[in-house]
Interface confidence: low
């Protein structure tokens, strides 16, 4: 296995998923795309949380930048060796795999959080409410309880669908960064092997 | 049509109960929350609470905690207002409203009001 | 909570005058809706959203303003224009109504 290669392809899939959470996570600030409910502060607490812009956007964009840039780097090497100045940086790659996992593990919790509150949302007597917030995420399950929030309209399916797509987002960038730690110690420790007939593609 | 018809005009004595009836019609009555506002006599409108008509919980103004109950009867879409151990400054009108929610949320549908008059 | 004080208490009016009311509030608000009431009668909604008539308002009626300073503006006066009108906000709990501004024709 080629473990540089496998990296760069780990890379390129944490910027398509760090650029999904990142609108993911900026759609919640808008219910229906009205920019009102956020002037007005009626978005639920998790939102604030900025776990898809941060922990599962701009946080994982380090270490896939990292993963990309493993493959192509020469490094200086270590005492004229390449190899063992690839070894280093697969290695450090280790590291930025676990800021990847802080960040995503970031994004999952704030996620789960979120869709367990439910949304801030007027509720069927008037009063800006956690409507869900006592069900202990049950209401996902009773989606005939979804009418007690009348506005946002739809705010429920709204913040549902987000923060279970960051949930998901987060839980493969997770996957993934803790995939490249394997794969950085074991590229770190096994030697960095590229030679054409053992290229791996991801 | 949408409407709130309240009930008649009660007179009553210091400590003694009293219940106003508001029955909605015209509109699905668990959609909308009951609001009930009371203006004294010469006085402006002071709100006092509403009543989660899906739910039937009720919620309290600062004001009205402890002899005031709202309750509902969901089967006759029905939402009450029971005043307890009466006090003379409880004379006034009553009126239960609906509340509009979607881009702006106001009052739209107010019952005619009931007048408690409590004198010994 | 947010207090809402109207102002003037009463307005004398002949027909065919402008006249503006406002309500102020202590704190900022998003909007304020504004009810009229005439004597014996429940209030009606007239204003809401700051600036929307409710349905049957004539259009010599308008609304505005932003912040703590809400105004509501009748054109040109009618005799049945003559009622006391309440501002009132749910911007903040608890929900809360102007003392009102009753307008008197001359």
């Known amino acids: 296995m080629c473990y540089g290669k496998c990296a760069r392809c780990i890379g390129h899939s944490l910027v398509g998923l760090a650029l999904l959470c990142i609108i993911a996570n900026i759609l919640l600030y808008f219910p229906n795309g009205e920019t009102k409910y956020a002037s007005e502060n009626h978005l639920s607490r998790f939102v604030w949380f900025f776990s898809g812009i941060v922990g599962g956007g701009l946080l994982m964009l380090l270490p896939a930048f990292v993963f990309i840039g493993l493959e192509q780097d020469d490094c200086c090497g270590c005492c004229g060796h390449e190899n063992c100045g690839k070894r280093c940086a697969m290695l450090s790659s280790v590291l930025a795999a676990l800021i990847g996992i802080a960040g995503s593990g970031y994004c999952v919790i704030v996620a789960a959080l979120g869709l367990a509150e439910g949304p801030l949302c007027l509720d069927s007597f008037g009063q800006w409410n956690y409507t869900f917030a006592s069900t202990e995420g049950q209401y996902l399950l009773d989606t005939s309880t979804w009418s007690q929030c009348t506005e946002p309209k739809h705010i429920v399916e709204w913040n549902v669908s987000l923060f279970s797509i960051l949930l998901a987002l987060g839980g493969i960038e997770f996957i993934l960064c803790l995939i490249q730690v394997i794969n950085g110690v074991l590229g770190g420790i096994c030697g960095f092997c590229c030679s054409r007939q053992q290229q791996y593609d991801c | 049509q949408i409407q709130l018809v309240q009930s008649g005009p009660e007179l009553k004595k210091p400590g003694e109960t009293v219940k106003i009836s508001c029955k909605a019609s015209g509109y699905t009555f668990t959609n909308y929350g009951v609001k009930w506002v009371k203006q004294a006599p010469g006085k402006d409108l002071k709100w006092m609470g509403w009543?989660?008509?899906?739910?039937?919980?009720?919620i309290y103004a600062a004001d009205f905690k402890g002899r005031f109950a709202f309750s509902l009867e969901t089967s006759a879409s029905t939402a009450f207002l029971q005043i307890n151990n009466l006090k003379n400054e409880d004379t006034a009108t009553y009126f239960c409203?609906?509340?509009?929610?979607?881009?702006?949320?106001?009052?739209?549908?107010w019952g005619a009001g009931t007048t408690v008059t409590v004198s010994s | 909570q947010i207090i809402l004080s109207q102002s003037p208490a009463i307005l004398s009016a002949s027909p065919g005058e402008k006249v503006t009311m406002t309500c102020r509030a202590n704190?900022?608000?998003?909007?304020i809706n504004w009810y009229q009431q005439k004597p014996g009668s429940s209030p009606k909604p007239w204003i809401y959203?700051?600036?929307n008539l409710a349905s049957g308002v004539p259009a010599r009626f308008g609304g505005s303003g932003s912040g703590t300073s809400y105004s509501l503006t009748i054109s040109r006066v009618e005799a049945e224009d003559a009622a006391t009108y309440y501002c009132q906000q749910w911007s903040s709990n608890p929900l809360t109504f102007g003392a009102g501004t009753k307008l008197e024709l001359r």
């Open positions: 009543i989660n008509t899906y739910t039937g919980n009720p």
């Open positions: 704190s900022g608000i998003s909007f």
């Open positions: 959203g700051t600036a």
């Open positions: 409203v609906r509340f509009q929610y979607g881009d702006y949320r106001y009052f739209d549908v």
